[in-house]
């Protein structure tokens, strides 16, 4: 997260880190005791999933292996359309005050809605600085029409934009797959943005979760 702040401890109990060995690979969101939602471009053969801690690499955090993941069938590596994936944990999470599932959206929030995005991604760009603490940024949803003025054909129909006018605050490498939460519901998954990160008036781009609720529910049901 560029130009963000340290999240209030324990305020994001649904936030997970997808690790490749001991290294951060992507963020993710707990949606069920067996399931984590993340970005399709985060796909690996297997994952180590850290839950229940704001500190990356926390020895006291829950760590669960995951060997199965299900990309949206319409995902494109080139355009990042349908950049959403479900990761099935090999064993169920122990729920607690530190580990909770996020609320999936009942509706799509409108432009102007205040939201928070979180992650352990680099806080500087192009030079990288990876924080140990979970970082947050407060952003507002931007209409598709406004966002298309910036990204033109790069922006797909189920992509959601968020940012703050003239501000550098944004997501960056390592934040991918993490949650954009608005009014206590998951509205977005970090997908992409301009590199180097933090270009003013280039919004962060997210997968719009409200458009995928049926796919999420059906995929979890099929593979339970």
């Amino acid at each position: 997260i560029i130009d963000g702040y340290k999240c209030k401890e324990g305020s994001h109990p649904w936030q997970v880190a997808l690790l490749k060995g001991n290294q951060l690979h992507c963020g993710g969101v707990l949606v069920d005791k067996y399931w984590v939602l993340t970005a399709a471009h985060c796909k690996m053969g297997q994952y180590q999933v850290q839950l229940g801690s704001d500190k990356i690499g926390d020895q006291s955090a829950q760590k669960i292996k995951a060997t199965k993941s299900f990309r949206h069938p319409g995902y494109s590596t080139k355009t990042h359309v349908n950049d959403i994936m479900l990761v099935r944990l090999d064993e169920p999470v122990k729920m607690s005050s530190k580990v909770e599932a996020v609320q999936l959206p009942e509706h799509c929030e409108p432009p102007g809605t205040s939201c928070t995005v979180s992650g352990w991604g680099t806080t500087t760009s192009p030079d990288v600085t990876f924080p140990s603490d979970l970082m947050c940024s407060d952003v507002k949803l931007i209409s598709s029409r406004e966002c298309k003025k910036v990204y033109k054909d790069l922006l797909g129909k189920t992509m959601l934009c968020a940012g703050i006018p003239d501000s550098k605050t944004n997501t960056c490498n390592g934040d991918s797959g993490g949650p954009l939460v608005c009014n206590d519901t998951l509205q977005g998954l970090v997908s992409w943005g301009t590199y180097p990160c933090g270009q003013p008036n280039d919004p962060g781009v997210y997968t719009q979760v409200c458009k995928y609720k049926r796919w999420v529910m059906e995929t979890m049901k099929t593979h339970r």
Epitope: H41, T77, H80, P126, D127, V128, V150, Y151, K152, L154, T171, C172, N173, S176, S191, W192, G193, T194, Y195, P196, C197, Q199, P200, N201, D202
Partner: antibody, heavy 122, light 107 residues
Framework: QVQLQESGPGLVKPSQTLSLTCTVS??????????WNWIRQHPGKGLEWIGS???????YYNPSLKSRVTISVDTSKNQFSLKLSSVTAADTAVYYC??????????????WGQGTLVTVSS | DIQMTQSPSSLSASVGDRVTITCQAS??????LNWYQQKPGKAPKLLIY???NLETGVPSRFSGSGSGTDFTFTISSLQPEDIATYYC?????????FGGGTKVEIK
């Protein structure tokens, strides 16, 4: 189809400033998610990235050339420019302007100009 | 800066041969690796992006693989029109850096 065209003098005297302009057609220089780059190739040699500029005006330069390079953009003309000061014979090269997809997820040069040979000689 | 070491610097092969070029990065670049083809007197052309993705319109005989520090570029069946110099390029960090190039000739 995006097209890029370099223009500027083909001969520059040592210690002077090399100035090149790239005119972009078929796409807007003010589009987000792209960088506008200068890349050079010494005769018979490999490719060297000089630097890039974004629609915001942010610039990034190769540290090896940073003290001598300035890249600027004129969105009204859909052009961006390169200035390289205090040139020597070692700056003789084919200079390319290029557009790169510049995203957190992937970054690559997808469109190149045809290149223009600049010779530094008195 | 990330150094890119490409090998071989040149090779000669027959039409129909399988050609392999390797590229090694001085540090982990994940899959931020692109391959370009440059014909004499022309600008480079993108063939492969993100280590293994074929650019639209590029023939399927070209392929790429690898992740981290070691990458491979393959032409499955060399054609006369493939005579060119091939460059790898890392896009993990600025400054973007290129390999030294591999000149491919027909025997």
């Amino acid at each position: 189809q995006v097209q890029l065209q370099e223009s500027g003098p083909g001969l520059v005297k040592p210690s002077q400033t090399l100035s090149l302009t790239c005119t972009v057609s078929g796409g807007s220089i003010s589009s987000g998610g792209y960088s506008w780059n200068w890349i050079r190739q010494h005769p018979g040699k490999g490719l060297e990235w000089i630097g890039s500029i974004y629609r915001s005006g942010s610039t990034y330069y190769n540290p090896s050339l940073k003290s001598r390079v300035t890249i600027s953009v004129d969105t009204s003309k859909n052009q961006f420019s390169l200035k390289l000061s205090s040139v020597t014979a070692a700056d003789t090269a084919v200079y390319y302007c290029a557009r790169a997809k510049a995203l957190t997820t992937h970054r690559y040069v997808d469109y190149w100009g045809q290149g223009t040979l600049v010779t530094v000689s008195s | 800066d990330i150094q890119m070491t490409q090998s071989p610097s040149s090779l000669s092969a027959s039409v129909g041969d399988r050609v392999t070029i390797t590229c090694q990065a001085s540090q982990d670049i994940a899959n931020y690796l692109n391959w370009y083809q440059q014909k004499p007197g022309k600008a480079p052309k993108l063939l492969i992006y993100d280590a293994s993705n074929l650019e639209t319109g590029v023939p399927s005989r070209f392929s790429g693989s690898g992740s981290g520090t070691d990458f491979t570029f393959t032409i499955s069946s060399l054609q006369p029109e493939d005579i060119a110099t091939y460059y790898c390029q890392q896009a993990r960090d600025l400054p973007f850096t290129f390999g030294g190039g591999t000149k491919v000739e027909i025997k």
